[in-house]
């Protein structure tokens, strides 16, 4: 009988230990959840405040309407210029309207004067059609003045108020474009 009682007591003690362990685990889990919650809230807070403080365009970029523009300070060939823009989360400039062209040429006059700047325009070798890098056609008023007699690939660039064409392997400055951040706060 005594042996039976001590066996029951041992089982109860074992049960108690298991329950204590479970409680300890639960407390630990609860604490971890609270910490994660705190971290999440802090992260959300930071994200919201940085979004609130962030300007529509990065530093050294120029804003016009929904676009941000970056005027390079280095020369490169057309293809490398495109890759340089992609590294900044942008593409070579795509001019959609005369108003945008006027803004660009006006800004360039203020910044640098009369240099050559690659834009995202190239001439298809087979058809001879001019196309922007996303595959769309330029509006009739924004076709490059024929200047290049190159047998190589021909790309578009801006100089003063004009859109011109040149061998894509020549070195020029370039202009990148990305969409401005919309303020959602």
């Amino acid at each position: 009988k005594l042996l039976q009682v001590s066996t029951i007591a041992m089982q109860q003690q074992e049960k108690l230990i298991q329950q204590e362990r479970a409680l300890l685990n639960f407390t630990e889990w609860k604490r971890s959840c609270a910490l994660q919650m705190k971290y999440c809230q802090a992260f959300m807070q930071n994200s919201l405040s940085s979004a609130h403080n962030s300007s529509p365009c990065p530093n050294n970029w120029i804003q016009n309407r929904e676009s941000c523009y970056y005027v390079s300070e280095i020369w490169s060939i057309w293809h490398t210029s495109q890759e340089n823009c992609l590294k900044e989360g942008s593409t070579l400039l795509q001019i959609e309207s005369k108003e945008e062209m006027d803004f660009i040429t006006g800004s360039l006059r203020k910044i640098k004067g009369s240099y050559d700047y690659w834009v995202g325009l190239s001439q298809d070798g087979h058809s001879g059609r001019w196309l922007w890098q996303d595959g769309s056609s330029p509006s009739p008023g924004l076709l490059p003045a024929e200047r290049s007699q190159s047998a190589n690939q021909v790309c578009g660039y801006v100089k003063s108020n004009s859109l011109l064409s040149s061998n894509c392997s020549t070195w020029k400055y370039f202009i990148c474009e990305k969409y401005a951040l919309r303020s959602s706060v």
């Epitope: 992609l86 590294k87 900044e88 989360g89 593409t91 795509q94 996303d134 474009e177 969409y179």
Partner: nanobody, 118 residues
Framework: QVQLQESGGGLVQPGGSLRLSCAAI????????MGWYRQAPGKQRELVAA?????????TYADSVKGRFTISRDNAKNTVYLQMNSLQPEDTAVYYC??????????WGQGTQVTVSS
């Protein structure tokens, strides 16, 4: 560190279609744009198409693929796709996925073979 895993390559007849996928695994916060390059035997690696990572994305295509190839992305899956239609023998190459990064080395995938032949 980010790993880029390409898939979807294979053998296709001229005029056929293929869709390549590039899944980015790891901390992709630093990636500013994703691109597809290709390299045919004895030729230089060339940019085929790219898409920027911002919510309002911008795209760029090589002249030779405009109107035939379309680049897109699924942010939820961290995956970029290249839909290739009207494939021609000259599209035969190893296609590589690239993750562009500002002020740092870019990430490259291992490549997937695309062969266009009858």
């Amino acid at each position: 560190q980010v790993q880029l895993q390409e898939s979807g390559g294979g053998l296709v007849q001229p005029g056929g279609s293929l869709r390549l996928s590039c899944a980015a695994i790891g901390n992709i916060a630093s990636i500013t744009a994703m691109g597809w390059y290709r390299q045919a035997p004895g030729k230089q690696r060339e940019l085929v198409a790219a898409i920027t990572s911002a919510s309002a994305s911008r795209t760029t295509y090589a002249d030779s693929v405009k109107g035939r190839f379309t680049i897109s992305r699924d942010n939820a899956k961290n995956t970029v796709y290249l839909q290739m239609n009207s494939l021609q023998p000259e599209d035969t190459a190893v296609y590589y996925c690239k993750g562009f990064r500002s002020g740092a080395d870019d990430y490259w995938g291992q490549g997937t073979q695309v062969t266009v032949s009858s």
